[in-house]
């Protein structure tokens, strides 16, 4: 049993450690950037390729605030949603809705999270509580994974991959509320 994902009142999916969120069906965040990434070498022929590295999928960047109970992160975090079908890198369209998706006739390739990073966020809470900290696990990159009929959905989570190292450097020190802490300035999370 890992850290669970839960929904807050705004129905935002908040991934906690150890559980990987499914990409939302639709993103309406105006800060979302659509980029085709993870391109590999183009295949000799679209129907002959067998190497997963020859496929590519989209990484959608979006920002959101992390919430925990009544608390919210001082700053938004940026993470990726792995989106769309996988196809040969050279045939991937550059924008959603343009071009025609290439679909392999044999095995299915899915765009799934590849690496994760944990980020420490400073939480601001109502009612005068001192800021406190939480770590959220965020998708750092996406990859194409070849699925055969023997694969099931649970294997898409790819639990074996190692999280990318979060950014280094001293971060502010969260303190629970105390006489001293009440006077402390709220510091940035990162």
């Amino acid at each position: 049993q890992g850290w669970q994902a839960f929904k807050n009142d705004a129905t935002e999916i908040i991934p906690e450690l150890g559980e990987y969120p499914e990409p939302p069906p639709e993103l309406e965040n105006n800060k979302t950037m659509n980029r085709a990434e993870n391109g590999g070498r183009p295949p000799h022929h679209p129907f002959e390729t067998k190497d997963v590295s020859e496929y590519s999928c989209r990484e959608l960047h979006f920002t959101r605030y992390v919430t925990d109970g009544p608390c919210r992160s001082a700053k938004p975090v940026t993470e990726l949603v792995c989106s769309g079908q996988c196809g040969p890198a050279r045939l991937l369209p550059n924008a959603i809705g343009r071009g025609k998706w290439w679909r392999p006739s044999g095995p299915d390739f899915r765009c799934i999270p590849d690496r994760y990073r944990a980020q420490r966020v400073q939480l601001l809470c109502p009612g005068g509580e001192a800021p406190r900290a939480r770590k959220v696990r965020l998708v750092a990159s996406c990859k194409c994974k070849r699925l055969t009929r023997f694969h099931n959905q649970s294997e898409l989570k790819d639990f074996g991959t190692e999280a990318a190292r979060p950014q280094k450097g001293r971060k502010p020190r969260p303190r629970a509320r105390s006489a001293k802490a009440n006077q402390a300035e709220l510091e940035n999370a990162y």
């Epitope: 150890g18 944990a118 900290a133 999280a163 979060p166 971060k171």
Partner: antibody
């Protein structure tokens, strides 16, 4: 599967130090906050402190300040708690716990019994 | 330090009973309250956090409520595996402190 496996029981003399280890598996230790909680025989739970293995940040209960040191080895995903100047009142089961916040304890180790006796 | 007072310190109940345990904080802790279950010789397990949010995998018969200084853990229909000691814990102010525990025994 999240697991925390602690080192074995220890018997120490008053004035000595003890170092308890806690091996974390199921996720990288640097992605968490590590907590230590103790429980004297037949008594309740007592929080000792937390640390952030990623940056070495720590917060200790004032009762243990100056006597406790919490460290981690991120290469082996192991947390350590060292308590010095032991007295008989330090006889307890020491638990490591981990979580994604500084204020709750999501997963716990099995506990390490430390007996302080002359 | 914030004192957490649990009552009762022990209770006897039968399988199927509705059990209520209360926890009172010596000062306002908002909703920074967690509940843990501990069985003899075992480590505690997180049941409830944020006063009322069930932890992953915890059965729905466990529920928490309250804010400020008064909190309640309710087991709607006691099961054989629920006989244990229950602790509340405040996460509002350092040092974090636990209640003295409530032992739920078989009647």
């Amino acid at each position: 599967q999240v697991q925390l496996v602690q080192s074995g029981a220890e018997v120490k003399k008053p004035g000595a130090s003890v170092k308890v280890s806690c091996k974390v598996s199921g996720f990288p230790i640097k992605d968490t906050f590590q907590h230590w909680v103790r429980q004297a025989p037949g008594k309740g739970l007592e929080w000792m402190g937390w640390s952030d293995p990623e940056i070495g940040d720590t917060e200790y209960a004032s009762k243990f300040q100056g006597r406790v040191t919490m460290t981690e080895d991120t290469s082996t995903d192991t947390a350590y708690m060292e308590l010095s100047s032991l007295r008989s009142e330090d006889t307890a089961v020491y638990y490591c716990a981990t979580g994604d916040t500084t204020y709750k304890f999501d997963f716990w180790g099995q506990g390490t019994t430390v007996t302080v006796s002359s | 330090d914030i004192q957490m007072t649990q009552s009762p310190s022990s209770l006897s109940a039968s399988v199927g009973d509705r059990v209520t345990i209360t926890c009172r904080a010596s000062q306002d802790i908002h909703t920074y309250l967690a509940w843990y279950q501990q069985k003899p010789g075992k480590a505690p397990k997180l049941l409830i956090y944020w006063a009322s949010t069930r932890w992953s995998g915890v059965p729905s018969r466990f529920s928490g409520s309250g804010s400020g200084t008064d909190f309640t853990l309710t087991i709607s229909s006691l099961q054989p595996e629920d006989f244990a000691t229950y602790y509340c814990q405040q996460g509002d102010t350092l040092p974090y402190t636990f209640g003295g525990g409530t032992k739920v025994e078989i009647k």
